[in-house]
Interface confidence: low
């Protein structure tokens, strides 16, 4: 019998260029008579054009929703009702070809063609894209607040904020033909729930979404987004009601930046330069294609690419890369944004050089990608360290911390976190090395103490990049480096001339002169430590809540001992900058560190002095007794302490702590406390210092109070941010 054919709705969106009409400002106002009249004519023309082709039998509905420059561009959508089996056949490309064919067939025709009655449509200016019913609904919901803007070359146009009576608005942006649009979004409030979506076409087509941002992001206070060409749409969806725009939008046309380079690297190791996507740090555009060719001077070297918060991964199946596709030596890799550093090491087997391609495979893009490139020695990629094949990084080996995710850097160590005697491979503790007392059989621990040695896990790197064998040589009153750099920046870590914390005792004035109290509206929230004349270090999680993210809220007190009273040695500061570690992850507490820049430099006194910062190679030996200080609760769940408390805690081996916390302890964490509990940090101590006293009498910052299970509980140690694990970021910011 007769079987009804299943029909489906296929939605298309597009634009066409009219050569015999000109755009006018009237056409940007939907309520104007000019807009209504032009829309009626354009709708008629569009319908006639479609019905003049084989598509006519499938025509369902259409709408012209906007106009733009060029001389006049009409933006439209239409729906065809088509048999299901023809769905794939009538792709946007096929539909565009049919319409263009129709337009071309009548260009020189003298016969009357209905759709050419008023409009001369440019066949080359017709664009048809795939859309969906959902896209049209999204577009229609913005039409009550629809703004068209043309931005000329050399112009930066600040867009008018949304209409707060509307729940959704659309900015339709257009620039000169051969340029690309760059949109800048700046969040101006600390908190909001607004949502903005940027599209690579004139309307909100989901398949052409470049990116969407939500709720006054602290991670990205400024976002710059590139379109692939001269058209873009931005859709705003209202969050909480606000009389103030929580963002500022501006747009400018920019020229296409070539992303191709040929480089020959020098005969030296380490970073030699930077490759980046066009207009970095802007988001890369949806049709980015970069091709970098690097020539390596000799086959002794491999090429290293060092990424920041971005990694390359092999896709097990041929799925598209959603965060950038890379091809390196014909190997396909996908980019992935991560909160970790990463290096890709490329073995070089031919002098022809290496070609690296980066492509945005889909319209969805992301933050621009920057990569440092350089050489490494193929026969010894990580001198004195371990090459972590999981992430391509050189990490310290056998230092008691599993820096490599698979832990291979700590496997099968003859001497873990100790010095290996040359004579018989016996292990001695690091403080015994270069201490003037031979401990190894033939005294190999006291050899080469006055000369440079190859750099390794526990060697100290001097400013001239040479290394010394003596562990922890900083600020011990004796120059060990040829350039004396181990004794520079040593005005730190000394206590004042002075004679909460669970299980602690009250501190005296000047005893911990680096201790900071971070307060909001007169209330102590977190601890911190002074590390330089204008910088205080604390935990990133202190600013976790959006309401705590603004610098204006915070006051920093130094030289303070009592919370309920002031004394002459006490000073206060406002905060001019707040920087969270870029890899900080709230859920895991990883990289739990933040830096506060004070509004003016400190004047050093007996009560206000910085603590010493350790070098990356500084070794805080497990078992060592160190001190934590703060005004935190004196018992779990209790109120904060009035007096600054101090308590000694023991440093715990990483593997033991990791076991207790079921392997949630990362290499940026350090544990301290006691198996039996009792002495520990507590609520309100967060961000405060864990300090250890060196043989020189100076105090070095080993950790920051970060997290733990309860306070002082048996078998649960306190977990601290490991300063040696984040020191390179601290130094980069502070210097």
């Amino acid at each position: 019998g007769y079987k009804a054919e299943v029909m489906v709705s296929q939605v298309y969106s597009g634009s066409l260029r009219v050569l015999n009409r000109h755009f006018s400002q009237d056409l940007t106002r939907r309520e104007s008579s000019a807009f209504r009249s032009e829309t009626a004519k354009a709708q008629k023309m569009l319908k006639e054009l479609i019905t003049s082709t084989r598509l006519g039998t499938y025509y369902n509905s259409s709408s012209v929703y906007s106009f733009g420059e060029g001389p006049l561009t009409c933006f439209f959508w239409f729906i065809l009702q088509i048999p299901e089996h023809r769905r794939l056949m009538l792709s946007p490309e096929v539909v565009q070809a049919l319409l263009v064919e129709e337009l071309l067939s009548t260009v020189n025709s003298s016969a009357a063609v209905p759709y050419r009655a008023e409009y001369e449509v440019d066949p080359e200016g017709l664009v048809i894209l795939e859309a969906s019913v959902k896209d049209i609904a999204a577009l229609n919901s913005t039409l009550g607040c629809y703004r068209y803007s043309y931005v000329g070359q050399g112009q930066v146009l600040r867009l008018k904020g949304p209409d707060h009576l509307a729940s959704s608005c659309l900015w339709h942006l257009q620039g000169p033909k051969d340029l690309m649009l760059k949109l800048r979004l700046e969040w101006t409030l600390a908190e909001c729930r607004d949502r903005l979506a940027m599209y690579d076409v004139a309307g909100p087509l989901e398949k052409r979404l470049i990116t969407s941002v939500y709720g006054c992001s602290r991670q990205e206070p400024v976002v710059e987004v590139l379109a692939s060409g001269a058209i873009m749409a931005v859709v705003w969806k209202k969050g909480l009601h606000s009389y103030y725009d929580p963002f500022v939008l501006s747009v400018q046309p920019v020229v296409f930046q070539a992303c191709e380079v040929n480089l020959t690297l020098d005969n030296r190791l380490d970073s030699q330069g930077v490759l980046s996507t066009p207009y970095f740090p802007s988001y890369y555009s949806p049709q980015t294609h970069c091709s970098w060719h690097l020539t390596v001077p000799s086959l002794d070297y491999g090429l290293a690419l060092w990424f920041d918060a971005y990694a390359l991964r092999r896709q097990k199946y041929d799925l598209p890369c959603t965060q950038g596709q890379w091809t390196i030596q014909n190997r396909r890799l996908c980019g992935l944004r991560i909160l970790q550093p990463y290096a890709e090491r490329i073995p070089v087997v031919a002098t022809a050089g290496i070609t690296i391609n980066f492509t945005s495979q889909i319209s969805l893009t992301g933050p621009g990608v920057r990569v440092h490139y350089g050489l490494y020695n193929q026969s010894d990629p990580c001198p004195g360290e371990f090459l972590c094949s999981v992430n391509g990084l050189c990490v310290p080996a056998c230092d008691g911390v599993k820096d490599c995710p698979n832990g291979l850097d700590e496997r099968n160590c003859v001497c873990r976190a100790t010095f290996q005697c040359k004579e018989d491979s016996t292990c001695i503790s690091l403080p015994k090395v270069c201490d003037g007392q031979p401990d190894c059989l033939n005294g190999s621990d006291e050899e080469q103490c006055q000369e440079g040695v190859p750099c390794g896990t526990f060697t100290f790197q001097c400013e001239d990049r040479s290394c010394v064998k003596k562990p922890n040589p900083q600020c011990d009153g004796r120059p060990d480096c040829r350039d004396g750099s181990d004794e520079e920046h040593c005005d730190c870590g000394l206590q004042g001339p002075s004679s909460r914390i669970v299980g602690g005792a009250v501190s005296s004035e000047g005893e911990w002169p680096w201790q900071a109290s971070l307060q909001v509206r007169g209330r102590h929230i977190c601890g911190g430590a002074l590390i330089a004349d204008r910088w205080v270090i604390t935990a990133a999680h202190c600013f976790q809540e959006d309401s705590m993210a603004s610098t204006v809220l915070w006051t920093v007190f130094l030289g303070k001992v009592w919370q309920n009273s002031r004394w002459p040695g006490e000073v206060s500061f406002k905060v001019s900058r707040l920087l969270l570690h870029p890899y900080h992850e709230e859920d895991s507490h990883d990289y739990d560190v933040a830096l506060l820049q004070l509004d003016h430099p400190v004047v050093r006194s007996a009560a206000v002095r910085p603590v010493c910062l350790p070098a990356r190679s500084h070794f805080f030996e497990p078992g060592l007794h160190c001190w934590i200080t703060g005004w935190g609760a004196l018992r779990e769940g209790g109120p904060i302490s009035n007096a600054l408390q101090k308590v000694d805690v023991q440093l715990i081996p990483q593997d033991l702590c990791s076991e207790v916390y079921r392997y949630q302890v990362t290499p940026r964490m350090l544990c301290a406390g006691y198996r039996k509990g009792k002495k520990d940090a507590c609520q309100g101590d967060s961000g405060g210092p864990l300090v250890c006293k060196a043989l020189s009498g100076r105090w070095f910052l080993a950790g920051l109070v970060s997290w733990g299970l309860g306070c002082g509980r048996p078998n649960y140690f306190g977990v601290y941010t490991r300063i040696t694990g984040v020191i390179s970021w601290i130094q980069q910011v502070v210097t």
């Epitope: 092999r314 193929q378 371990f386 094949s389 999981v390 698979n406 832990g407 850097d409 099968n412």
Partner: antibody
Framework: QLQLQESGPGLVKPAETLSLMCTVS??????????WGWIRQPPGKGLEWIGS???????YYNPSLKSRVTISVDTSNNQFSLKLRSVTAADTAVYYC??????????????WGQGTLVTVSS | SYELTQPPSVSVSPGQTARITCSAD??????AYWYQQKPGQAPLLVIY???ERPSGIPERFSGSSSGTIVTLTIRGVQAEDEADYYC???????????FGGGTKLTVL
């Protein structure tokens, strides 16, 4: 063409230490791209991975054998060795040295020696 | 300890298709590799990364992966394909190499 050649005694007494050497030709052990390892196969049975080593000396072992195994490297002679302590009759097997491609998601053995039979018997 | 499970034996007539399976929990995350071992010889890698064939391996050998099961397929089996076949992968951390128990392929 890469070749691996095992050498060592074919007979070891119980409780003693089994020692084998693998000589690599056609590639440098110090190539930063590969691990080098040992696999064994008891007569009539399946394959068992013993452990692998990176040229820098970093090693990792099958957890079931870890307490008895040492794999070490001699880069100057392009050789690596296996020591298995306190052997019993259960350690009688053909021992293969292999090149272990263990980079990123890869984890396989692309070149094998021809194998050497070691019998544990008094 | 982590294990890969294979059938002990598979028999097939010449010209037919042989399928050997291997299952384990980590296989969706870790690649599988297949080795052929003939009597008195060292194993030979015939499939790597689930489905890729090293150069020199005949096209009749192919591999596939679906969830926790990987399959070695030999189409148009020949007498010379009679051998033991071992699948190999890694534990879920990617640290340790693990072999299946092996499958004896008999060509009838």
């Amino acid at each position: 063409q890469l070749q691996l050649q095992e050498s060592g005694p074919g007979l070891v007494k119980p409780a003693e230490t089994l020692s084998l050497m693998c000589t690599v030709s056609g590639d440098s052990i110090s190539s930063s791209h590969y691990f080098w390892g040992w696999i064994r196969q008891p007569p009539g049975k399946g394959l068992e991975w013993i452990g692998s080593m990176y040229y820098s000396g970093s090693t990792y072992y099958n957890p079931s054998l870890k307490s008895r195994v040492t794999i070490s490297v001699d880069t100057s002679n392009n050789q690596f060795s296996l020591k298995l302590r306190s052997v019993t009759a259960a350690d009688t097997a053909v021992y293969y040295c292999v090149r272990h491609n263990n980079w990123g998601l890869d984890n396989y053995f692309d070149y094998w020696g021809q194998g050497t039979l070691v019998t544990v018997s008094s | 300890s982590y294990e890969l499970t294979q059938p002990p034996s598979v028999s097939v007539s010449p010209g037919q298709t042989a399928r050997i399976t291997c299952s384990a929990d980590a296989l969706p995350d870790q690649y599988a590799y297949w080795y052929q071992q003939k009597p008195g010889q060292a194993p030979l890698l015939v499939i790597y990364k689930d489905s890729e064939r090293p150069s020199g391996i005949p096209e009749r050998f192919s591999g596939s992966s679906s969830g926790t099961i990987v399959t070695l397929t030999i189409r148009g089996v020949q007498a010379e394909d009679e051998a033991d076949y071992y699948c190999q992968s890694a534990d879920s951390s990617g640290s340790y190499a693990v072999f299946g128990g092996g499958t004896k392929l008999t060509v009838l």
